[in-house]
Interface confidence: low
């Protein structure tokens, strides 16, 4: 089966837009829009810090850490109100991702 131009293969994702807001000193806010072509029961998410199709139930329940969003060796924790997650590196550096 051939794909039309711009059509994603099932189970794959692409980042549609990327931007960084460096207006706040010492803090970088990165924004992204990800487009995925997922199988039934899946939805766009993040696995091992890369865009991926994940089980839709994870998104519905906001159990973000269940999609394994952090890199291997990092610890995942839910933010208050399940608004996102943090990835804590072994050295203690914390990377925060919020879902909007």
């Amino acid at each position: 089966q051939f794909l039309k131009e711009g059509q994603l293969a099932a189970g794959t994702c692409e980042i549609v837009t990327l931007d960084r807001d460096s207006s706040q000193p010492r803090r970088t806010i990165a924004r992204q829009t990800v487009k995925c072509s997922c199988f039934p029961g899946q939805i766009a998410g993040t696995t091992r810090a890369r865009p991926a199709c994940v089980d839709a139930r994870i998104i519905k329940t906001k159990q973000w850490c269940d999609m394994l969003p952090c890199l291997e060796g990092e610890g995942c924790d839910l933010l208050i109100n399940r608004s996102g997650w943090t990835c804590t590196q072994p050295g203690g550096r914390i990377k925060t991702t919020t879902v909007s």
């Epitope: 131009e5 711009g6 692409e14 980042i15 990327l18 931007d19 992204q32």
Partner: antibody
């Protein structure tokens, strides 16, 4: 196993357009960002450009107008529009990866073995 | 235009020594750097991405560090098989101007 293979490299005369192709095995090219990189004999690596799954492209400033990256459902192609002797190099295609969620670092996780292009009179 | 200044151009080390290669970006690249090893006649292979993340299958003697515009690849306890040329790749993708990637000039590592 995920692999890339380039083809189309050969001896051409200056000014003769040449198109190189990159094919994948073990994964579906259509869903990935792909890049082309070249290396002149005895020299370092030079990034040429990138093509997105949507088909849009970005190029290094020096490569704009000199190269065109395009794709089909099974290949990613690089056209050297008007080759000069300075374009003699090994050309690599590479799969682009990048981790997201807290940054947009871009890197190449799979490379092809390269294909040699020689531009000579 | 992003410029990646890689130093030193070449170095010689004995087995077991620690080797450090530095790349200085012309602007803050937000950890958008990766490191590659290339041996003669072969394509490069990924060692480190996102400044400090070790690619799967790469020996742990390789490590990356740095932030902002200053980054370092360290080979702790260099081995004979580490003789190669090493390259950094810097870049950041913005929605406004697209992707801009630049390689450093390379560092040739010789093992005595």
């Amino acid at each position: 196993q995920e692999q890339l293979v380039e083809s189309g490299g050969r001896l051409v005369t200056p000014g003769t357009p040449l198109t190189l192709s990159c094919t994948a095995s073990g994964f579906f090219l259509s869903g990935y960002y792909m890049s082309w990189v070249r290396q002149a004999p005895g020299k370092g690596l030079e990034w040429i450009g990138i093509i997105y799954p949507s088909g849009s492209t970005d190029y290094a400033s020096w490569a704009k107008g000199r190269f065109t990256i395009s794709k089909t459902s099974t290949t990613v192609d690089l056209k050297i529009t008007t080759p000069t002797t300075e374009d003699t190099a090994t050309y690599f295609c590479a799969r682009v990866a990048g981790y997201v969620g807290y940054g947009y670092e871009t890197f190449f996780d799979i490379w092809g073995p390269g294909t040699l292009v020689t531009v000579s009179l | 235009e992003l410029v990646m200044t890689q130093t030193p151009p070449s170095l010689s080390a004995s087995v077991g020594e620690t080797v450090r290669i530095r790349c200085l970006a012309s602007e803050d690249i937000y950890s958008g750097i990766s490191w590659y090893q290339q041996k003669p006649g072969k394509p490069p292979t990924l060692l480190i991405y996102g400044a400090s993340n070790l690619e799967s299958g790469v020996p742990p003697r390789f490590s990356g560090s740095g932030s902002g515009s200053d980054y370092t690849l360290t080979i702790g306890g260099v081995q004979a098989e580490d003789a190669a040329t090493y390259y950094c790749l810097g870049g950041v993708t913005y929605s406004s101007t697209g992707t801009h990637l630049t390689f450093g000039a390379g560092t040739n590592v010789e093992i005595k």
